[in-house]
Interface confidence: low
């Protein structure tokens, strides 16, 4: 009974197509597969950024796989051939591992790369990124931003930079068609006559960095002698009502401060007959049903009632 063996895949490599972190892992079938012509060979692929504690594991019949990585760090991957038990009349047979690595050789010291990179997708419509120059870089240093997401043919450079003292410190993006709910890759690199500049890579999903506009049209309505309903409207724009959470801040007679988080555009407040003044503000954020994270909007304009019986008046602004 000869032991069945299989070779690892050939020509295993990580290919960088220039998409700023979205890499191709590809390989060729192992040598000497003639004995297993009737067999569908599978491959077990493991990969990770160097320094990560866990490997991502994929089992595939294909000869390639694509995923996103953090190019600030190196990447390591390994793959072996799997012969299912149906092919071997017994247990599954695995080859030895083929291994490969990939990294972008860092240029310049870490202090030269951009600091405090901050990207906000305003009202799910306009993406703006800003940064600070690296420590001690001279005014001849300039930074350039490139971006890519699935759907673009190649990485694009920012065409509308925000400048300070002649240096690029931010980018206003054009309309980004079909760009949410997928990884969005950014590279900020730089050039200087004096010294090399370290590149920085960033990956996020646009729906997770949305800062909505604040709610509008705040109103009061007396529901009963001890209840007041606060209402507001969602801001204009592409974000549907079902995607909002709200935070309300209510002040009664300049003493009591109530804060509450709610999911719809109303809030009922218990009051006493002695209430002489009532003010409230609201802000909005994209909720967990539409994103994994988000940024609170600015507070709305303050709406106040003062000195008149609330049962006789509804305020609208």
């Amino acid at each position: 009974d000869t032991e069945i063996k299989v070779n690892p895949p050939q020509d295993f490599e990580i290919v960088d197509p220039g998409y700023l972190g979205y890499l191709y892992l590809q390989w060729q079938p192992p040598l000497s597969l003639d004995h297993f012509k009737e067999c569908t060979v599978e491959y077990e692929l493991k990969y990770r950024n160097i320094g990560s504690e866990t490997w991502k594991t994929i089992i595939t019949k294909n000869l390639h796989y694509k995923d996103g990585f953090d190019l600030n760090k190196g990447i390591e991957a390994k793959i072996h051939t799997l012969l299912p038990w149906q092919c071997t009349n017994g247990s599954e047979v695995q080859s030895s591992w083929a291994e490969t690595t990939y990294w972008i050789s860092p240029q310049g010291i870490p202090e030269t790369k951009v600091q405090d990179m901050d990207c906000v997708y305003y009202n799910w419509q306009y993406l703006l990124c800003s940064w600070k120059p690296g420590i001690g870089v001279l005014l001849d240093t300039n930074y350039n931003l490139f971006y890519w997401y699935e759907g673009l043919d190649h990485a694009l450079q920012c065409v509308d930079y925000i400048k300070a003292d002649g240096q690029n410190i931010g980018c206003r993006f054009p309309y980004l068609e079909a760009s949410d709910y997928k990884d969005f890759y950014i590279c900020v690199n730089g050039s200087s006559e004096n010294k090399p500049i370290r590149s920085s890579y960033f990956t996020f999903q646009l729906q997770n960095i949305v800062k909505p506009l604040p709610p509008v049209y705040l109103t009061f309505t007396r529901e009963s002698s001890c209840e007041i309903k606060l209402k507001w409207s969602i801001p204009l724009g592409p974000i549907p009502a079902r995607c909002f959470d709200y935070e309300i801040e209510i002040r009664e007679d300049d003493t009591t401060l109530v804060t509450a988080t709610v999911e719809n555009e109303t809030y009922t407040l218990k009051t006493t007959n002695e209430t002489r003044q009532l003010c409230f503000v609201v802000r909005s954020k994209v909720n967990i049903y539409c994103s994994d994270d988000g940024i609170w909007s600015e507070w709305s304009d303050k709406q106040c009632w003062e000195g008149e019986d609330l049962s006789k008046k509804t305020l609208l602004r």
Epitope: G51, P110, E111, T112, G136, V137, L138, N194, K195
Partner: antibody, heavy 119, light 111 residues
């Protein structure tokens, strides 16, 4: 928030070794270096060396080069500093301190571990 | 090794005063257009706290009354208006080259 928690105080005999640990949390451990600094009672600060939590690369102060070993365990986000052939003048508080690039300074420090060398 | 000399070694001042501490390096600590000089505050029984990095950049959450200046070999830490919690020991530290070194410290005491 960033936290560096060090192991407890040690009393050791001259000629022996001591191994101090520093467990990090609240940040991406492998993006930073960990420095070790000591302070003898009533004295100033002395830099012992540092280790890159990403690659394990070390830079030691020549004064300690033959006696110090720094190691990292990325699975537990812990850095270790072992000092051997201890003598009474090694009695000090030993601190771990996080650093990024050289110019960023050591921005977060452990609470310190008092090592007393006494026969 | 780069030697850092701090002066004065002790300083008596009152709340509201302006305090200035200097640090002189035995050779330039500048490189890549950056001054690799940091300032720390330490209170008894506590670890040092980073106040200033890269000669003049403030550490996170530090009060604006702390400022740093200088380049090359001469550096200054200034506290514009002393508060009761500022009375402590201050150290300068260079990180241009290994071994990183500290100044001898300046003890700031209430007059």
């Amino acid at each position: 928030q960033v936290q560096l928690v060090q192991s407890g105080a040690e009393v050791v005999k001259p000629g022996a070794s001591v191994k101090v640990s520093c467990k990090a949390s609240g940040y991406t451990f492998t993006n930073y270096w960990m420095n070790w600094v000591r302070q003898a009672p009533g004295q100033g600060l002395e830099w012992i060396g540092r280790i890159d939590a990403y690659a394990g690369e070390t830079h030691y102060n020549q004064k300690f080069k033959d006696r110090v070993t720094m190691t990292v365990d990325t699975s537990t986000s812990t850095v270790y500093m072992e000092l051997s052939s201890l003598r009474s003048e090694d009695t000090a508080v030993y601190y771990c301190a996080r650093g990024y690039g050289d110019a960023y300074g050591m921005d977060h420090w452990g609470q310190g571990t008092l090592v007393t060398v006494s026969s | 090794d780069i030697v850092l000399t701090q002066s004065p070694s002790s300083l008596s001042a009152s709340v509201g005063d302006r305090a200035t501490i200097t640090c002189r390096a035995s050779e330039s600590v500048d490189n890549y257009g950056i001054s690799f000089m940091n300032w720390f505050q330490q209170k008894p029984g506590k670890p040092p706290k980073l106040l200033i990095y890269a000669a003049s950049r403030q550490g996170s959450g530090d009060p604006a009354r702390f400022s740093g200046s200088g380049s090359g070999t001469d550096f200054t830490l200034t506290i514009s208006s002393l508060q009761p919690e500022d009375f402590a020991t201050y150290f300068c530290q260079q990180s241009k080259e290994v071994p990183w070194t500290f100044g001898g410290g300046t003890k700031l005491e209430i007059k």
